[in-house]
């Protein structure tokens, strides 16, 4: 069964800077990745970035840099200040779509006891939805 993992890290140098990494553990080819915060996209979450493997990347503030790391994983750097700044308990969600086979989404947030700049290696997060 395909799974999605999400890792959130706060940068030690800039406390308002977050790095979100997401990956797809499955055999299907990815047609689109959507990253949101505040909950799943379409369920109250706000889209931060959308990545297409061939057509490009779209991103919105406070997203600073979204990129593909591998064919099945992406990373997103967030920088914010004031109202647009993420906080330590912000939830980030990643949805990997393989059209028309299905889509898989998982969410994560900064580990409550983690020091800035430190985090555990990525582990599969619960699948919230598999269409």
């Amino acid at each position: 069964t395909p799974e999605v993992w999400v890792q959130v890290r706060m940068e030690a140098t800039e406390l308002s800077s977050f790095t979100i990494r997401c990956g797809f553990l499955g055999s299907g080819s990815i047609s689109l990745v959507t990253v949101s915060w505040g909950g799943p996209n379409g369920a109250g979450g706000t889209t931060l970035a959308v990545l297409h493997p061939e057509r490009g990347i779209r991103q919105w503030a406070p997203a600073r840099q979204a990129r593909w790391e591998t064919q099945s994983s992406i990373s997103l750097i967030l920088e914010g200040s004031g109202a647009s700044s993420p906080c330590a308990n912000t939830t980030f969600c990643c949805k990997f779509a393989s059209f028309p086979e299905g889509s898989w989404e998982a969410c994560g947030s900064l580990p409550p006891s983690s020091d800035p700049g430190l985090s555990a290696p990525p582990t599969p997060a619960p699948i919230l939805r598999a269409d």
């Epitope: 047609s31 689109l32 959507t34 996209n41 959308v50 779209r58």
Partner: nanobody
């Protein structure tokens, strides 16, 4: 939960017409386009057969221009595809999808289960 439900498919003779409907519910979509996509038996997925973006710009695949018409009813949260002068090569599973525009193409982020359209005499 996201739900896009297609209806209106079926068996029709060449030259006939069908109207596909897609009802969206259970979510507020944050993308910027919706459209109809199709997958013919034993073939790959077609690029958007007909798509419409948030500004109302409509795009059709060359193979359906002049025969298919896409429309939407925002009040009913619905998308439609009127298909006229159907041909055997239009036989496929048709998917309603909502997505994001990249380079003028609508890329699906959410979609329904699909509805079968068969054109045969």
């Amino acid at each position: 939960e996201v739900q896009l439900v297609e209806s209106g498919g079926g068996l029709v003779q060449p030259g006939g017409s069908l109207r596909l409907s897609c009802a969206a519910s259970g979510f507020t979509f944050s993308g910027d386009c919706m459209g109809w996509f199709r997958q013919a038996p034993g073939k790959g997925l077609d690029e958007g057969v007909a798509t419409i973006d948030n500004a109302g710009r409509i795009k059709y695949a060359d193979s359906v221009k002049g025969r298919f018409t896409i429309s939407r009813d925002n009040a009913k949260n619905s998308l439609y595809l009127q298909m006229n002068s159907l041909r055997a090569e239009d036989t496929a599973v048709y998917y309603c999808a909502a997505g994001w525009t990249f380079g003028g193409q609508c890329s699906p982020a959410d979609w329904g289960q699909g509805t079968q359209v068969t054109v045969s005499s």
